[in-house]
């Protein structure tokens, strides 16, 4: 939800976390604000303290339970409210009825590892973290490889249009250092977005054997 210079955005990680960002220009850095979450069909409610992440934005994580517990479903609506302290009173700044499975952003993939590396090829695998079993196989991935002398932004995106937690990188240069990242996105949800990129995995291709073209 947006109003001029104020904006309130939240995403559900599909299990037990709703992450929110509240931004407003001209607010004091020491303003005390909170996000309150009230599900329409659950007995619990949750609050988190918004902490500054930049000059005009604050963020917090609503921890709904154990990391892998399924705390919300596709039929839930969670009313999220931003409340900021002004003097002795709390002022409601934003109200958003939040459909968790329409606003998904999964955790970054984890456990990246080199399965097999050759002179021109490298097979890499990873795992998804805290992703709901509701998705079954309805996930897609994007991957990118950092080559020497280039930036991540220049790296071409490789798209995997299915739940495939491995990739075989080809046409690599022998005896060269690379880095690799991957991110994930469910197919479900009108406002769903890509997860953050994984931590980069560094690997080196094998040197070419002397007198051989491999």
């Amino acid at each position: 939800a947006v109003n001029g210079t104020s904006q309130f955005t939240c995403f559900y990680n599909s299990r037990a976390n709703i992450s929110c960002v509240w931004s407003q220009d001209g607010a004091l850095q020491d303003t005390s604000c909170q996000v309150h979450a009230w599900p329409d069909r659950r007995r619990w409610n949750q609050t988190c303290e918004l902490l500054p992440v930049s000059q005009a934005s604050w963020a917090c994580n609503l921890i709904l339970g154990a990391p892998d517990s399924q705390k919300l479903t596709t039929v839930d609506i969670v009313t999220l409210r931003v409340l900021c302290r002004e003097g002795v009173r709390w002022r409601v700044m934003a109200i958003q009825d939040f459909k968790p499975f329409e606003n998904l952003r999964l955790m970054a993939p984890i456990s990246l590892q080199v399965v097999h590396v050759e002179t021109h090829r490298c097979n890499i695998s990873w795992e998804i973290s805290q992703a709901s079993h509701y998705f079954e196989r309805h996930l897609e991935f994007e991957a990118r490889t950092l080559s020497p002398g280039h930036t991540w932004e220049e790296a071409p995106l490789l798209t995997l249009k299915q739940k495939q937690e491995w990739i075989c990188l080809e046409t690599l240069t022998p005896d060269t250092q690379y880095e690799f990242q991957v991110r994930v996105k469910p197919l479900q949800g009108e406002f769903t977005t890509w997860s953050p990129w994984s931590q980069p995995l560094a690997f080196r291709t094998k040197p070419a054997a002397l007198g051989k073209d491999t």
């Epitope: 939800a1 109003n3 001029g4 104020s6 904006q7 609506i77 409210r81 409601v92 934003a94």
Partner: nanobody
Framework: QVQLQESGGGSVQVGGSLRLSCATS????????MGWFRQTPGKEREGIAA???????TYADSVYDRFTIAQDNAQNTLYLEMNALKPEDTAMYYC??????????????????WGKGTQVTVSS
């Protein structure tokens, strides 16, 4: 469908008060947020106050501490109590309703239902 009908507008002196009402009818159970907008000629509608089912209210800075939004669920009526009125409060006031609340500082985004409006004039 939901129907909204505003009333209570009129002319008032600077510093005076008015209470606007918005009668709601139809499928009111689907409504999760209600609010007030205002518009002056040649300008966009400005969201100034909104309230959710639980009675949490949010206001634009321009009316905070002067206007109060309230609802009477038994009567299916929304109110806007306007105090310490200023000439710049002169506008057409519209009632609005949402099936899903999306409100920041009194301004709803994605309004599902509108009233036809009631005129408020503040003269010095």
């Amino acid at each position: 469908q939901v129907q909204l009908q505003e009333s209570g507008g009129g002319s008032v002196q600077v510093g005076g008060s008015l209470r606007l009402s918005c009668a709601t009818s139809g499928d009111t159970k689907s409504i999760r947020c209600m609010g007030w907008f205002r518009q002056t000629p040649g300008k966009e509608r400005e969201g100034i106050a909104a309230i959710d089912r639980e009675g949490f209210a949010t206001y634009a800075d321009s009316v905070y501490d002067r206007f109060t939004i309230a609802q009477d669920n038994a009567q299916n009526t929304l109110y806007l109590e306007m105090n310490a009125l200023k000439p710049e409060d002169t506008a057409m006031y519209y009632c609005a309703a949402q099936n899903m609340c999306r409100v920041v500082r009194g301004a709803m985004t994605g309004v599902d239902y509108w009233g036809k409006g009631t005129q408020v004039t503040v003269s010095s």
